[in-house]
């Protein structure tokens, strides 16, 4: 978790003096509680928006926005906590708003927004946002917390982010797979502009089960430049196994840009159509 | 092929633990955690709690808070769920899926059943 | 905790038919809602994540649709593999609570 590198992080708006600073998630309010504390706040709104660096690369960022309660506690309200966990990992970031003018109540709704946490693809969080200062150890809460789901490189707007393309989101092998004679499957796809090697992986199942009844590796070799963006064919022999029919084929490549993290591609062939039991033809026919 | 396999089904006495085993194998582990689920016969089904594979942190249902314990096994890929005091409304099929938000991909089930 | 509640609890439809499953929150979840089908027997399956979001295999007859408290899921063309048992889940806020579920029937 990191927040986006560029401009100075401003949360000032008409009517207040608001200034952005780093946080360590433990706010003083916590330490030395406060007999007045503001409530809740209202409407908390997380969404997916994207943002370049001044490097120019693009990141898919959590957009937070949040009102504030028409009530007297914004007398009292000295700014906030942004807080955004990484579910799986427990990696934590904040921000505080720290307001430097008193919060007035004017003719429409105090609004907030901030939009520099930098999230990672196809990942879970949850995100809080704290008014300042935190209330007593028994006060009512004056948090909200949201959780918040990263689409991963599949989705269009996330293919064209660095982060997915670091990972081959605009490889398309467009993988076909075709059964042979013989037990065989021939498996083609385009190669990327690239010279690394790849990986094709075959699983495969009994119809309707999905525990594999055979597993195979191939390696194939880091292609020439004048072979990138043409089609690789390799036929792979299958076990001879009666009902193992329905193969998985994911193929595994190792950019540069992402090593053995890259994204798998895959392909799947079903097990064929089993065809309805004839009618039996009889050997005579009857002659009503 | 992500695949997620369970431990088979236990028959327990009311009183006692039961420990449910979910193996994960195709994809990196570390990467999403595990949640459990568990539907009781002809039930819905109820969300339990979910473990983090990357740091062992564990959030559960207040229900369950107390009697269950969720943990994992990095070198093995494997995650447990273990359930105390057993009462015969326990018996359900108990599932692990992997993720927290959005449950993409779920073990078989294992049925507990509670039964004096 | 936040309660999920679908409607219908059952429904018969015949193969070819526009079904039409929906789930109300009591409180706004804004998109965080998904849709699993679970057929008897077997474990759920997630079909549209996020309210409207296809998971990938997924056929394109289903669709789901919503946001904030009233969300719906559709399958276009009923097929024989459809007929199962489907439950919507909300995770806006921990714990991810389910609805207790619609069971898609044949007519």
């Known amino acids: 978790l990191r927040l986006l590198d560029h401009r100075a992080l401003v949360c000032s708006q008409p009517g207040l003096n608001c200034t952005v600073k780093n946080s360590t998630c433990l706010d003083d309010s916590w330490i030395h509680p406060r007999n007045l504390t503001p409530s809740s706040p209202k409407d908390l709104q997380i969404q997916l928006h994207f943002a370049h660096t001044q490097q120019g690369d693009l990141f898919p960022v959590a957009h937070i926005e949040w009102t504030l309660q028409t009530d007297a506690s914004i007398l009292y309200l000295e700014g906030a906590e942004l807080s955004v966990l990484q579910l799986n990992t427990n990696e934590r970031l904040c921000v505080r708003f720290e307001f430097l003018s008193k919060l007035r109540h004017h003719h429409r709704r105090w609004r907030f927004t901030f939009s520099h946490f930098v999230v990672d693809p196809d990942q879970e969080y949850e995100v809080t946002v704290h008014h300042l200062p935190k209330p007593i150890p028994d006060g009512d809460p004056n948090h909200q917390s949201k959780n918040f789901l990263v689409p991963d490189c599949e989705h269009a707007r996330m293919k064209v982010t660095t982060p997915c393309m670091s990972s081959g989101s605009l490889w398309d092998p467009n993988i076909t797979v075709e059964t042979l004679e013989a037990h065989q499957l021939r498996v083609s796809f385009t190669l990327w502009n690239e010279s690394t090697h790849y990986q094709i992986l075959l699983t495969s199942f009994p119809h309707m089960e999905n525990h594999s009844c055979f597993e195979h590796m191939h390696h194939i070799p880091a292609p020439r430049p004048e072979e990138f963006h043409q089609r690789s064919n390799v036929t792979l022999t299958l076990r001879n196994l009666k009902g193992c029919c329905r193969h998985q084929v994911q193929i595994q490549p190792f950019f540069s840009s992402c090593l053995n993290d890259c994204l798998r591609h895959s392909a799947t062939v079903s097990c064929p159509e089993m065809p309805d039991t004839p009618e039996p033809i009889p050997d005579y026919m009857p002659l009503w | 092929q992500v695949q997620l396999v369970q431990s088979g089904a236990e028959v327990k006495k009311p009183g006692a633990s039961v420990k449910v085993s979910c193996k994960a194998s195709g994809y990196a582990w570390t990467r999403y955690g595990i949640s459990w689920v568990r539907q009781a016969p002809g039930q819905g089904l109820e969300w339990m709690g979910w473990?983090?594979?990357?740091?062992?942190?564990?959030n559960y249902a207040k229900k369950f808070k107390g009697r269950v314990t969720m943990t994992t096994d990095t070198s093995t890929s494997t995650a447990y769920m273990e359930l105390r005091s057993l009462r015969s409304d326990d018996t359900a099929v108990y599932y692990c899926?992997?993720?927290?938000?959005?449950?993409?991909?779920w073990g078989q089930g294992t049925l507990v059943t509670v039964s004096s | 905790d936040i309660q999920m509640t679908q409607s219908p609890s059952s429904l018969s439809a015949s193969v070819g038919d526009r079904v039409t499953i929906t789930c109300r929150a009591s409180?706004?979840?804004?998109?965080?809602l998904n849709w699993y089908q679970q057929k008897p027997g077997k474990a759920p399956k997630l079909l549209i994540y996020?309210?409207?979001n296809r998971e990938s295999g997924v056929p394109s007859r289903f669709s789901g649709s919503g946001s904030g408290t009233d969300f719906t899921l559709t399958i276009s063309s009923l097929q024989p593999e459809d007929f199962a048992t489907y439950y919507c889940q909300q995770w806006a806020n921990m714990p991810g609570t389910f609805g207790q579920g619609t069971k898609v029937e044949i007519k």
């Open positions: 899926a992997r993720r927290v938000l959005r449950l993409d991909y």
């Open positions: 996020a309210a409207s």
């Open positions: 473990i983090s594979t990357y740091s062992g942190n564990t």
């Open positions: 409180q706004d979840i804004d998109s965080s």
